[in-house]
Interface confidence: low
């Protein structure tokens, strides 16, 4: 004996991608000699049975037989979403609804508020925007493998009344560390599947100089010919060295060449040298004894720096 | 119309843990967002977490963060929020909420129906 409940149609909420094809599958046991039919929610009838309805070369049939109506809905669009109800004709009729959740797909976020010729321990302040999400997407900040606590996202309803815009800002004091990173901003939504949807802005932070005296061979020996590289890194790179010799007053002033050249290695060569790299961005001094031996393997000499 | 019951509140120590329930009724439950506010006493109501329909997505205050989780199982139509390391500073009426429509939302305007409030007490 059939029960009542064997003549209800039964289907199943669904969500699908704007843009992609969404399956509406609706059944019943007992079909009591009725057709099943689909409707939008606008209540249009889509297909009754196998029997198109509407006119909308996006709807097809994809099964049709007693017990079941299945059709699919390709294309979709966010104006789709809704209650599509299955109906079965019987004394009295039953339907059954089927809500379909369309997400909307967020647009690559854009990145805005950089402003050059940040300096070191300045404060930067970069906004994010991605539209078009359905539900309201989430945005995240990173620095390289760093996670960065970006304002909580904000979250504003787009013109067509659907879909949202959201936004959020994040505020950072920079290090030398920082010069050449990139901050990116990650859009996270349901709808990309995992897919990673970010925009990076490659960040210039200027600094003072540093530098390192670098001897050449790093063991000389009386004779030898050597050179003494200042090495200088900053942003933007020194582009002025000016080498003394101390002890002397005031110190002897050598030349402005990153490299200090010795063609034949003297005794009276021996002394602390100091090397002063400049850039717009300020100065630093490093130092190098210099003790220059016998020729003899033995190697003696040391280097200090500030 | 959707209803939200609570469950779950109670006294508890510092550094002690608790869950929240708030088991809703109406069918299209799972097609909509879901938070947890709470209220503590003279001050006003503050947003703690947030989930998507889909529990893919979820939001969390500051002061929830590391320490809270919020999950649904939509076949119960149940939210919940799991709280470890509790603070005397969470001491507070705690509210689950649902919008009227799937917006999710991180501010209680966003939300149309609340719970009854179940209050938590973390104290020595």
């Known amino acids: 004996n059939l029960s009542q409940d064997d003549s209800q149609p039964w289907t199943s909420d669904e969500t699908v991608v704007a843009g992609g094809t969404v399956v509406l599958k609706c059944q019943v046991k007992d079909h009591e000699d009725s057709s099943l039919q689909w409707s939008n929610p606008a209540q249009q009838t889509l297909y009754f049975g196998e029997k198109r309805a509407l006119r909308d070369n996006r709807i097809q049939l994809v099964t049709s037989t007693p017990h079941e109506l299945s059709i699919s809905i390709s294309n979709v669009a966010l104006a789709d979403e809704g209650e599509y109800t299955c109906s079965i004709f019987t004394m009295p009729v039953r339907t059954a609804k089927s809500l379909v959740t369309v997400l909307g797909i967020p647009q690559k976020p854009i990145i805005t508020g950089y402003k050059s010729s940040l300096r070191e321990k300045d404060t930067a302040t970069l906004n994010c925007q991605s539209s078009g999400s359905k539900p309201a997407a989430r945005l995240t900040w990173r620095k390289g493998d760093q996670e960065l606590h970006g304002e909580p996202t904000r979250i504003q309803e787009d013109p067509n009344g659907k879909t949202f815009t959201v936004s959020s800002s994040v505020t950072f004091q920079v290090t030398r560390e920082d010069d050449g990173a990139s901050i990116v901003c990650s859009v996270n939504h349901e709808s990309l599947k995992g897919a990673d949807r970010s925009t990076s802005q490659r960040i210039e932070v200027l600094y003072t100089p540093t530098a390192m005296i670098r001897p050449d061979p790093p063991h000389p020996r009386e004779g030898q010919k050597l050179l003494l590289h200042c090495e200088g890194r900053g942003n933007p790179v020194p582009q002025q060295y000016l080498w003394e010799k101390e002890g002397s007053v005031p110190p002897l002033k050598m030349t402005q060449e990153s490299a200090l050249i010795f063609p034949f290695l003297n005794k009276s060569d021996s002394g602390t040298y100091g090397c002063t790299a400049t850039s717009n961005m300020g100065s630093y001094k490093a130092y190098y004894t210099l003790n220059v031996n016998d020729p003899s393997p033995v190697p003696s000499s040391s280097s200090t720096y500030h | 119309q959707v209803q939200l019951v609570q469950s779950g509140g109670g006294l508890v120590q510092p550094g002690g843990s608790l869950r929240l329930s708030c088991a809703a009724s109406g069918r299209t439950f799972s097609n909509y967002a879901r938070g947890w506010f709470r209220q503590a006493p003279g001050k006003g109501r503050e947003f703690v977490a947030a989930i998507d329909y889909s529990g893919g997505s979820t939001n969390y205050a500051d002061s929830a963060k590391g320490r809270f989780t919020i999950s649904r199982d939509n076949s119960k139509n149940t939210l919940y929020l799991q709280m470890n390391s509790l603070r005397a500073e969470d001491t507070a009426v705690y509210y689950c909420?649902?919008?009227?429509?799937?917006?999710?939302?991180?501010?209680?305007?966003?939300?149309?129906?609340w719970g009854q409030g179940t209050l938590v007490t973390v104290s020595s």
């Open positions: 909420a649902a919008p009227a429509s799937r917006r999710p939302s991180w501010d209680a305007d966003g939300y149309d129906y």
